[in-house]
């Protein structure tokens, strides 16, 4: 489903490149915001979000934060620009196309992110950095 | 500059089958879901199928007519989208499109013909 | 799968004119509409989303309207460049349709 407040399409007068020069198109991503989650202890996760959008810009980036406090477990999933913090932290991952959770410092919770390039990237969510691999035995375990 | 270029159309018998090509450049064509969208003569605009990203499994979808007979592949290495049409029927008559999936970018188009 | 029903098929109008294309939808589609143009030869070319909102580039004259399951493709002011097929698409769901298409001819 493409929420229609965030369904774009390529804007051809302002074209956006990476850093190789190639062209970037909008990303389709998860975008649910926060939801309640029941992914804990696990090496990777799905999002659990029915609804996939079309970001609003083409330098927009998909993003996942996953929470933990002594109430709840949630996970955010939206679409952000990378030149711009999100919780007050750098995407530094934002070219990796697949959404590596990297553990950042918040008081009085647990607190995960993750930002990658590829469509619908932050449906599956890795938090095991043995799954950050090539090996496609590894990828046939988290497409399962 | 971005290009689609289709490629692998011409004209095969009921019941054959045919691989169609998508060359794409300027853009990062792993990090993409693509369709394939096609048009038979003086007809309508009908989607086919697409293909999902490598990294989240390359799933694919297809429309009611397609399904079982057509297979939808990508080879990121190569930044080329396939369709494989087999058991081709007369109605699979068309110009085909390589699309960027759900956004507004498409190939010139290839033509199949299905006749005898 | 979600029908998509353009009305009319054709019309025959004037440069000036002011045109309606309809598109109505088997079932609610929230504002999951899009319009496309379509020349002979050529590849389709976006002109709303949403429903409503004009595609980068797109003239002013064209507008969209509607959601649910009816919607409106407005030409307020037809241009010679406007003569060519328009059709609807919903985004709704998988599969994404199109209506049969609406083919603008010149009067």
């Known amino acids: 489903t493409i929420p229609p407040h965030v369904q774009k399409s390529v804007n051809n007068d302002m074209i956006v490149t990476d850093n190789n020069g190639a062209v970037k198109f909008p990303q389709l991503c998860k975008f649910c915001d926060v939801r309640f989650s029941t992914c804990d202890n696990q090496k990777s996760c799905m999002s659990n979000c029915s609804i996939t959008s079309i970001c609003e810009k083409p330098q927009e980036v998909c993003v996942a934060v996953w929470r933990k406090n002594d109430e709840n477990i949630t996970l955010e999933t939206v679409c952000h620009d990378p030149k711009l913090p999100y919780h007050d932290f750098i995407l530094e991952d934002a070219a990796s196309p697949k959404c590596i959770m990297k553990e950042k410092k918040k008081p009085g919770e647990t607190f995960f992110m993750c930002s990658c390039s590829s469509d619908e990237c932050n449906d599956n969510i890795i938090f095991s950095e043995e799954y950050n691999t090539s090996n496609p035995d590894l990828l046939l375990v988290i497409f399962q | 500059q971005v290009q689609l270029v289709e490629s692998g159309g011409g004209l095969v018998e009921p019941g054959g089958s045919l691989r169609l090509s998508c060359a794409a450049s300027?853009?990062?064509?792993?990090?993409?879901?693509m369709s394939w969208v096609r048009q038979a003569p003086g007809k309508g605009l009908e989607w086919v199928g697409r293909?999902?990203?490598?990294?989240?499994?390359?799933?694919?979808d297809f429309a009611a007519p397609v399904k079982g007979r057509f297979t939808i592949s990508r080879d990121d290495s190569k930044n080329t989208l396939y369709l494989q049409m087999n058991s081709l029927k007369t109605e699979d008559t068309a110009v085909y499109y390589c699309?960027?999936?759900?956004?507004?970018?498409w190939g010139q188009g290839t033509l199949v013909t299905v006749s005898s | 799968d979600i029908q998509m029903t353009q009305s009319p098929s054709s019309l025959s109008a004037s440069v000036g004119d002011r045109v309606t294309i309809t598109c109505r939808a088997s079932?609610?589609?929230?504002?999951?509409l899009n319009w496309y143009q379509q020349k002979p030869g050529k590849a389709p070319k976006l002109l709303i989303y949403?429903?409503?909102s004009l595609q980068s580039g797109v003239p002013s004259r064209f507008s969209g309207s509607g959601s649910g399951t009816d919607f409106t493709l407005t030409i307020s002011s037809l241009q010679p460049e406007d003569f060519a097929t328009y059709y609807c698409q919903q985004s709704y769901s998988t599969p994404p349709t199109f209506g049969q298409g609406t083919k603008v001819e010149i009067k």
């Open positions: 300027g853009f990062t064509f792993s990090n993409y879901w």
């Open positions: 079932q609610s589609i929230s504002s999951y």
């Open positions: 293909i999902k990203t490598t990294y989240s499994g390359g799933a694919t």
């Open positions: 949403a429903a409503s």
């Open positions: 699309t960027l999936d759900l956004r507004d970018y």
